[in-house]
């Protein structure tokens, strides 16, 4: 059998396999030794058995979308059934004081690995053996420590594949320079080590994205907004965009990024190198927020100018792929990290991304303030009680709620909170009247509402002990 | 084509109000702000404000805030500017403007209006 | 709100002749500015849009440069057409702000 019998159906076209290259991969054209690695169709009864207690799920993730000539990575995460675990040592065993369908097991390992490599090797003194190998019979290579590694990992995509030993958990990384653009098929098988065998215990796939487009998302900030996610804002008061860039490898550090905003409220184009803006929009109704991002990042050169006659059929100068994976010190494939470009050749080529939105302005209340704190005379039953007229003002629309949250002086526990509703005037003038429990110092925070906005203000008040003496004490501000 | 036809020539009393109109034909009259601009003979341009005809949302320039006020009819996708208390200083051509399809300032002015006020 | 200081008021300059108008902001205003032609009786015209960019349908003796907060109109060649009043406007905030205008007269 081949690699690609084995690990899926999906085949790209001819073309598709001679530029899609990626370096430190091989062709699944290979051939697949079966003894070693058993091929199970989906649905094979021998599945039910391939893990003791379960069955193992692998999760797959990329940090797609990529864009072109960025490093994507991938990471397999398996998933044991419940109370096992993988020890430090690589063996699989059973959690402590964990009850699964079976109960308790008496016998420590699932799969104790180190005591089978140690009875079942029958090694040459290097180490190397005809079973240590992988599928396509290429020996595992010997990090340090390797003997703990008992998971086989066959990663395929574009025709290629690329084969990994790893412990429960293992990540590659891809060059994507030459990866045709959109949706691509990345599928794993995963085989476990069974004596001088291997057993397939779990395959999964996901889809990945490559793309010339920056991926782009921003989020939107503004003080009093009472709900960030919605895309409504309010009037007068500036909202702050920040422009966040999928670049988990980091492939535009050294790039100048140049962002282009138009706020859809015919204030004309701010353009900055900064990835924060803050727009303040002083008309309420629906504006489409366009936001462009443009990059300078590495990318292909441009063919050299043909030469004067062609002697004979130069070789392509397109960029290969390179992997290389995180467990190990270099690059998974024999040849070092760098791009196999012709020497000192070095272009650049601007990239864009493109962000869009609608966005909603209303009115909201912009300001709240405490203008007045008044002490209310007290009738004689409650000495221990004091209570406080708040005289507040707003700014912007009419407040439809009220909220007190009272705290101990470093505004961080909280001791009470009520809301009530308001029935406000167009002054926006009103008392708000609250009991305090005793003497001390008190945090009040204290919000103003309506549907779309929630201003907050806070002060730090000191009430006096109570005179048990005196019925009644004079009102004073 | 774009335009902005606006009403005609106004002669009205000290203390009164005038309602001038901008109507508005070639687009969506909703998707574009209607700006308002004053000149008195023979001075320069001055911004009075702004409408929102998508949603009535409105922008004053400090000094217009009590004297103009801007409305829109989606209907007749037409703009108005109410000038109230009116005095002599008032006496000026209105103008009525538009920005492109792009975020770009005025493209296109309504012809004006001439409001004299005189006893 | 943003001052937008025009000079000169006004000016008088010969058929073919090469001539400049500034405008200053009192903010960084990027490239968002305006310049506006405005004939006796007549609504302001459209000249140039994004500090530099032409607007359709005008001539090419009439170019704009500048970013920030500083400004200019530069008409080369001067025809007998191109006397009228002229104003910026920045458009970056509102309040829009208008130059104070230039008077360009025939000499």
């Known amino acids: 059998k081949r690699f690609h019998d084995v690990l899926g159906n999906e085949r790209p076209s001819a073309y598709m396999r001679e530029h899609n290259q990626l370096n430190g991969w091989s062709s699944d054209e290979n051939d697949w030794n079966e003894k070693l690695y058993p091929v199970w169709k989906r649905g094979d009864m021998r599945w039910k058995n391939s893990w003791k207690g379960g069955r193992v799920q692998a999760v797959l993730t990329s940090d797609s979308p990529a864009l072109v000539g960025s490093n994507i990575t991938f990471a397999v995460n398996l998933i044991f059934p419940r109370c096992q675990k993988e020890d430090a040592n690589g063996n699989i065993v059973y959690e402590k004081n964990c009850r699964n369908e079976a109960g308790l097991s008496a016998d420590p390992y699932v799969y104790n690995w180190t005591a089978w490599s140690e009875d079942s090797d029958g090694e040459n003194g290097t180490g190397q053996s005809h079973h240590n190998v992988f599928p396509d019979g290429k020996p595992f290579p010997h990090h340090p420590g390797w003997r703990r590694w008992n998971f086989i990992y066959v990663f395929h995509t574009l025709g290629q594949y690329f084969q990994k030993l790893g412990r429960c958990s293992v990540r590659v990384s891809v060059n994507t320079a030459n990866v045709t653009l959109g949706p691509q098929l990345m599928e794993v098988t995963v085989y476990r080590r069974h004596g001088r065998a291997y057993v397939p215990i779990a395959q999964v796939k996901d889809v990945y994205v490559v793309t010339d487009q920056i991926p782009v998302f921003v989020t939107m900030f503004q003080k009093n907004d009472r709900n960030s996610s919605d895309e409504t804002f309010l009037k007068d008061l500036p909202i702050m965009f920040d422009v966040l860039i999928h670049d988990p490898s980091h492939f535009l550090n050294y790039s100048t990024i140049n962002y282009k905003w138009s706020f859809g409220d015919n204030t004309g184009l701010f353009v900055s190198t900064n990835h924060t803006v803050n727009h303040t929009y002083v008309l309420n109704g629906t504006f489409s927020l366009n936001l462009t991002v443009k990059a300078a990042a590495p990318g292909p050169c441009p063919p050299p100018p043909p030469p004067p006659r062609p002697s004979k059929p130069t070789p392509s100068l397109a960029t290969t792929l390179k992997s290389y994976d995180s467990n190990t010190p270099g690059p998974a494939g024999d040849n070092p990290l760098e791009l196999s470009r012709i020497p000192d050749e070095n272009c650049q080529i601007n990239r864009y991304g493109h962000f869009q939105a609608t966005i909603t302005i209303v009115e909201g209340i912009l300001e709240v303030n405490i203008i007045q704190m008044t002490d209310v005379l007290m009738p004689v039953p409650w000495p221990e009680s004091s209570l406080i007229d708040f005289v507040v003002t707003c700014q912007g629309s009419i407040p439809t709620e009220v909220c007190t949250i009272i705290s101990d002086p470093t505004c961080e526990i909280t001791q009470n909170t009520v809301c009530s509703p308001v029935d406000v005037d167009e002054m926006c003038l009103l008392t708000v009247r609250r009991t305090f429990n005793g003497s001390g110092t008190y945090c009040v925070n204290l919000t103003l509402g309506d549907d779309t906005s929630l201003a907050l203000t806070s002060t730090l008040i000191s009430v006096p002990d109570r005179d048990p003496a005196s019925p009644l004490r004079m009102a004073n501000s | 084509q774009v335009q902005l036809q606006q009403s005609g020539a106004e002669l009205v009393r000290p203390g009164t109000s005038v309602k001038v109109s901008c109507k508005a034909s070639?687009?969506?009259?909703?998707?574009?702000?209607i700006e308002w601009v004053k000149q008195r003979p023979g001075q320069g341009l001055e911004w009075i404000g702004v409408?929102?005809?998508?949603?009535?949302?409105?922008n004053y320039i400090e000094k217009f805030k009590g004297k103009a006020t801007l409305t829109a009819d989606k209907s007749s996708s037409t703009a108005y500017m109410q000038l109230s208390s009116l005095t002599s200083d008032d006496s000026a051509v209105y103008f009525c403007?538009?920005?492109?399809?792009?975020?770009?300032?005025?493209?296109?002015w309504g012809q004006g209006t001439l409001v004299t006020v005189s006893a | 709100e943003i001052q937008m200081t025009q000079s000169p008021s006004s000016m008088s300059a010969s058929l073919g002749d090469r001539i400049t108008i500034t405008c200053q902001a009192t903010?960084?205003?990027?490239?968002?500015l305006n310049w506006y032609q405005q004939k006796p009786g007549k609504p302001p015209s459209f000249l140039i849009y994004?500090?530099?960019e032409l607007a359709e349908g005008v001539p090419s003796r009439f170019s704009g440069s500048g970013s920030g907060s500083d400004f200019s109109l530069t008409i080369s060649n001067l025809e007998s057409e191109d006397f009228a009043d002229y104003y910026c406007?920045?458009?970056?905030?509102?309040?829009?702000?208008f130059g104070g205008g230039t008077k360009l007269e025939i000499k």
């Open positions: 403007a538009r920005g492109a399809n792009w975020d770009v300032g005025f493209a296109y």
């Open positions: 406007l920045q458009f970056h905030e509102f309040p829009r702000t």
């Open positions: 409408i929102n005809p998508g949603s009535g949302g409105t």
């Open positions: 903010q960084d205003i990027v490239k968002n």
């Open positions: 994004y500090a530099t």
């Open positions: 070639g687009y969506a009259f909703s998707n574009h702000l």
